[in-house]
């Protein structure tokens, strides 16, 4: 999959809107690798 | 608001270098990646670089590296774009931008800085 | 790199218009795709991220669509301030790479 910073903003974007924004405080695109998803 | 405001017009002399600063305000600067392009006179958009603010992480266009050189100033929320070795086809308005999730999602731009090289 | 083909390169149209302008990347970018518009003297704005998804605030006249290779954006109804230049943006790969434009002129 993409890893770009791009694609991890807009995968990472995607993932808060579905989760509600219940996430970690430091799950954001600059601390979060393309690993995380 | 968030905004994204770059520094003014600069006229540069071949073979000079000149840097751009990009003032980051209405989000966490250290959260999202700061991109940086360009646009020569009629010209279609160019990609130069990108840099992680949070850990100083950079990518290149290979056409610039060597060239451009991508900084930050975390305390400053403030983004650099240095282009060293000017010549006249470096003539362009030179754009920071960022997608941001918080507050709003949405890919922000600045207002552009014109770089002249002439001699 | 990969190359962003843009067509029509100019196109001349009225207010009402059904406006399409496609991109053709020269190898696969999944629907890694984005659209600009710019405006004479005007910084970039961006209207639609992943090949099909408006960002807040866009008008819903402007749609995007594809994957792969061939994406397409199109205005349903062209109103007086869409009259700007259209980019479609490849954030796949790096380099990102930008189409040549489409400038969309009052006929």
């Known amino acids: 999959s993409c890893n770009t910073a791009t694609c991890v903003t807009h995968r990472l974007a995607g993932l808060l809107s579905r989760s509600g924004g219940v996430v970690k405080d430091n799950f954001v695109p600059t601390n979060v690798g393309s690993e995380a998803f | 608001e968030v905004q994204l405001v770059q520094s003014g017009a600069e006229v540069k002399k071949p073979g000079a270098s000149v840097k751009v600063s990009c003032k980051a305000s209405?989000?966490?600067?250290?959260?999202?990646?700061m991109n940086w392009v360009r646009q020569a006179p009629g010209q279609r958009l160019e990609w130069i670089g990108d840099?992680?603010?949070?850990?100083?992480?950079?990518n290149y266009n290979q056409k610039f590296k060597g060239r451009a050189t991508l900084t930050v100033d975390k305390s400053a929320s403030t983004a650099y774009m240095e282009l060293s070795s000017l010549r006249s086809e470096d003539t362009a308005v030179y754009y920071c931008?960022?997608?941001?999730?918080?507050?709003?999602?949405?890919?922000?731009w600045g207002q552009g800085t014109t770089v002249t090289v002439s001699s | 790199d990969i190359q962003m083909t843009q067509s029509p390169s100019s196109l001349s149209a009225s207010v009402g218009d059904r406006v399409t302008i496609t991109c053709k990347a020269s190898q696969n970018v999944d629907t890694n795709v984005a659209w600009f518009q710019q405006k004479p003297g005007k910084s970039p704005k961006a209207l639609i991220y992943s090949a099909s998804y408006r960002y807040s605030g866009v008008p819903s006249r402007f749609s995007g669509s594809g994957s792969g290779t061939d994406f397409t954006l199109t205005i349903s109804s062209l109103q007086p301030e869409d009259f700007a230049t259209y980019y479609c943006?490849?954030?796949?790969?790096?380099?990102?790479?930008f189409g040549g434009g489409t400038k969309v002129e009052i006929k």
């Open positions: 209405g989000y966490t600067f250290t959260d999202y990646y």
């Open positions: 840099i992680n603010p949070n850990q100083g992480g950079t």
């Open positions: 943006q490849q954030y796949n790969n790096y380099p990102y790479t």
């Open positions: 931008a960022s997608i941001i999730i918080v507050p709003n999602y949405f890919d922000y």
